[in-house]
């Protein structure tokens, strides 16, 4: 199952179930862990372990919690105010600016280079030239992850209204 949020993954715009806590918006916004009701009068709590909101908002939905992909480990579970934190398994890494997937770390350095940094969940091994000490950027090109959009929820007539 994809860990990416598409429109289909948003919690539906529905009246709060009886067990969902309600409070009043403050200056039109609801606190983290809540979303606003359709009439704008109530803040409805997100469902623990299912969806979340991390910031003050007037969203009509909470966001679906991420499920860690295979090849990832869960560092911390999803709460009503924070999404799941996933980390690449040992021997794989995901760079800060690379697509959202874990890539295998290289097992060794090219000829004429020495390893100066280990594989971590966020970086490949680091190699430098024996003589010059200059870094080697690594030959493995970033793998693109293709995400196609799904039809999702029908468009709201007054989105991001301004």
């Amino acid at each position: 199952e994809s860990a990416l949020i598409t429109q289909q993954d948003l919690a539906p715009q529905q009246r709060a179930a009886p067990q969902q806590k309600r409070s009043s918006p403050s200056e039109g916004l609801c606190p983290p862990g809540h979303h606003i009701s359709e009439d704008g009068r109530d803040c409805i709590s997100c469902k623990y372990g299912q969806d979340y909101s991390t910031h003050w908002n007037d969203l009509l939905f909470c966001l679906r919690c991420t499920r860690c992909d295979s090849g990832e480990v869960e560092l911390s579970p999803c709460t009503t105010t924070r999404n799941t934190v996933c980390q690449c398994e040992e021997g794989t890494f995901r760079e800060e600016d690379s697509p959202e997937m874990c890539r295998k770390c290289r097992t060794g350095c090219p000829r004429g280079m020495v390893k100066v940094g280990d594989c971590t969940p966020w970086s490949d091994i680091e190699c430098v030239h024996k003589e010059s000490g200059t870094k080697h950027s690594g030959e493995v090109p970033a793998v693109e992850e293709t995400v196609t959009s799904s039809p999702g929820t029908p468009a709201s007539p007054c989105s991001l209204s301004g």
């Epitope: 908002n57 709201s156 989105s159 991001l160």
Partner: nanobody, 124 residues
Framework: EVQLLESGGGLVQPGGSLRLSCAAS????????MSWFRQAPGKGREFVSY????????AYADSVKGRFTISRDNSKNTLYLQMNSLRAEDTAVYYC?????????????????WGQGTLVTVSS
């Protein structure tokens, strides 16, 4: 992939207002997750505001809550960030980001399309 171009930055006095624009081209934005991030000198990119193009509502960082508002104009394919009561600590390069799907809406890594940024300087 969508192309984004920000504008509207500049020098403003504390307490003043600015409206940033993010013009999108390349494809329709229906269903897109849209966010504003900012980057102050020597710091990482910080989440500012989030919304979905064709759904109501937005989320705001604590630091801008009640002062900044995200909006959009369908006919112009443009996202806006209205910034009021500006403070010196709002000084940064502001970036617009978009993605058809996101993993964590407040994480810069979740977005695959970025504008080049527009500089906002708040100073007297």
């Amino acid at each position: 992939e969508v192309q984004l171009l920000e504008s509207g930055g500049g020098l403003v006095q504390p307490g003043g207002s600015l409206r940033l624009s993010c013009a999108a081209s390349g494809r329709a934005l229906t269903g897109y997750h849209m966010s504003w991030f900012r980057q102050a000198p020597g710091k990482g990119r910080e989440f500012v505001s989030y919304g979905i193009w064709d759904r109501a509502g937005a989320a705001y960082a604590d630091s801008v809550k009640g002062r900044f508002t995200i909006s959009r104009d369908n006919s112009k394919n443009t996202l806006y960030l209205q910034m009021n009561s500006l403070r010196a600590e709002d000084t940064a390069v502001y970036y617009c980001a978009a993605s058809m799907a996101v993993r964590t809406y407040y994480s810069p890594r979740s977005y695959d399309s970025w504008g080049q940024g527009t500089l906002v300087t708040v100073s007297s």
